[in-house]
């Protein structure tokens, strides 16, 4: 049967390919739970770390500068970019029906939690997404520390602040700065960028079972680790690519159910810093060692 579908409502059609939407959502959930899962579930602490790393764990003070100073004195610890050292997928792209780009074989471990990371619009605790795959993996850090020399000062007691510097018309540079906290961990073995080997183990959850594909040597748990410089970061998907990768048409409005399919990809993209570029110091027009926002939408 053809894959495209149409909504049964007057003057409304939708090109959603539900098979692709489900598989792609599962893929992104798998990435997130691989990074933040613990014992095959997303603990409150793991969930807290995810929120922390996507920058919504606490109120942040934002400063927007309208002077055109192109060389603010920003410093980052580039060793601790917020990228996973084993979860990069530059080819994870699909087009409307099934353009066959590989996801790569990133096997993750886990059982099934009932709830997707994006909440339902109309559902109880049973959850929306039966495909959430959880697993083990090291956590993505905030930047270890940073100094800033900006006109509007921020209270030294504030743990995290977000600073926008207007570098040129319509362009902003985002830096999230976090003072180091006691007890931050630096895992010893974080250099491997290869996916886990496929070794079958079995686990059972309340409602279903997952036989896990685990690696023999997984990245040790920790909040911070560095990324290999030769890795390709996950591609920054704009709106069209997000839709087509989930088998959705780009010319029609999204309803809540369709948007729900996109939630894990959006979170994964934020968490992986897919749309931030660690710019070269050679580029005079851009402040050194600054994460710039790609024009993705």
């Amino acid at each position: 049967f053809p894959q495209t579908t149409e909504k049964i409502s007057p003057n409304w059609e939708s090109g959603i390919n539900v098979d692709l939407a489900i598989s792609t959502r599962q893929y992104h959930l798998q990435q997130l739970f691989y990074r933040y899962g613990e014992n095959n579930s997303l603990s409150v602490e793991g969930f807290r770390k995810l929120l922390q790393n996507i920058g919504i764990d606490k109120i942040k003070r934002i400063h927007i500068h309208h002077d055109h100073d192109h060389h603010s004195d920003h410093e980052h610890h580039s060793d601790h970019e917020r990228h996973s050292d084993h979860e990069h997928h530059s080819e994870h792209e699909h087009h409307s029906d099934h353009d066959h780009h590989s996801h790569h074989n990133h096997a993750a471990s886990g059982k099934n939690k009932r709830k997707a990371l994006c909440p339902d619009h109309d559902s109880d605790s049973s959850g929306k997404d039966p495909r959430n795959s959880q697993g083990k993996g090291a956590h993505r850090p905030e930047h270890a520390s940073g100094r800033r020399n900006v006109k509007d000062s921020v209270s030294a007691s504030e743990v995290t602040s977000t600073v926008y510097n207007t570098v040129s018309e319509g362009t902003h540079f985002l830096e999230t700065i976090e003072t180091p906290r006691p007890g931050k961990l630096f895992p010893k073995d974080v250099s491997s960028s290869t996916p886990p080997s496929v070794t079958s183990k079995s686990r059972v959850s309340r409602l279903a079972g997952r036989k896990t594909n685990e690696s023999v040597s997984e990245p040790r748990k920790g909040f911070m680790y560095s990324r290999n410089t030769n890795e390709n970061p996950q591609e920054c998907f704009n709106a069209s690519k997000l839709l087509t990768s989930h088998g959705m048409g780009i010319q029609v409005p999204l309803n809540a159910t369709e948007f729900n399919y996109l939630c894990p990809a959006i979170i994964n993209q934020i968490d992986a810093r897919s749309c931030l570029i660690h710019t070269s110091e050679k580029k005079a027009e851009i402040p050194p060692k600054t994460y710039s926002l790609q024009i993705a939408w």
């Epitope: 539900v18 692709l20 489900i22 996801h103 279903a208």
Partner: antibody, heavy 113, light 107 residues
Framework: QVQLVQSGGGVVQPGRSLRLSCTVS????????IHWVRQSPGKGLEWLGV???????DYNAAFISRLTISKDNSKSTVYFQMNSLQAEDTAIYYC???????WGQGTLVTVSS | EIVMTQSPATLSVSPGERATVSCKAS??????VVWYQQKPGQSPRALIH???YRYSGVPDRFSGSGSGTDFTLTISSLQSEDFAVYFC?????????FGQGTKVEIK
């Protein structure tokens, strides 16, 4: 054209294992998950499990102890193995892509001595 | 597991008439429901997904509605080729579960 072609099945003795194959064309196993469902007169349609794009598997808890789903992406083939079959496992077994659109032709498995 | 209960088990309808099949979930499944048609000796054919989306190629006399726990498949004007067994399935929670089927037969 999307197709799922199943092979294997037939008569299996009680206590023995069943191995089925599902070879797909028209799409990639790195893009879509493949589900297994069975249908019997007594129990109707039962979802058994799925293998996702990255190789992870989710199983119906009722079958996890004796079910293994694997795949070979290069061969575009998914493998289904169920151990310790009993008479009540007699059914038509289907592979399917996603919860909906494309199903294999089904293969009848009869567990009998 | 979520139990999907279909009613009626058998529906006797004359050609040209409307047929309505009901499916009730034992807990909220949002709109994660698909409807299948199955004819003897054939694999199930998906008609509707996400409770109310019709696959292209499926005649517009088939429609689906509902969310949460109550779902309905409606065939507005039965044609001879529509006499078959219809199943609902939820894919909100593991294990994905099916209704027991509703046989739509000629009256």
């Amino acid at each position: 054209q999307v197709q799922l072609v199943q092979s294997g099945g037939g008569v299996v003795q009680p206590g023995r294992s069943l191995r089925l194959s599902c070879t797909v064309s028209g799409f990639s196993l790195t893009t879509y998950g493949i589900h297994w469902v069975r249908q019997s007169p007594g129990k109707g349609l039962e979802w058994l499990g799925v293998i996702w794009t990255g190789g992870t598997t989710d199983y119906n808890a009722a079958f996890i102890s004796r079910l293994t789903i694997s795949k070979d992406n290069s061969k575009s083939t998914v493998y289904f193995q169920m151990n310790s079959l009993q008479a009540e496992d007699t059914a038509i077994y289907y592979c399917a892509r996603g919860p909906s659109s494309y199903w294999g032709q089904g293969t009848l498995v009869t567990v009998s001595s | 597991e979520i139990v999907m209960t279909q009613s009626p088990a058998t529906l006797s309808v004359s050609p040209g008439e409307r047929a309505t099949v009901s499916c009730k979930a034992s807990q909220n499944v949002d709109t994660n429901v698909v409807w299948y048609q199955q004819k003897p000796g054939q694999s199930p054919r998906a008609l509707i997904h996400s409770a109310s989306y019709r696959y292209s190629g499926v005649p517009d006399r088939f429609s689906g509605s509902g969310s949460g726990t109550d779902f309905t498949l409606t065939i507005s004007s039965l044609q001879s080729e529509d006499f078959a067994v219809y199943f609902c399935q939820q894919y909100n929670n593991y294990p994905w579960t099916f209704g027991q089927g509703t046989k739509v037969e000629i009256k």
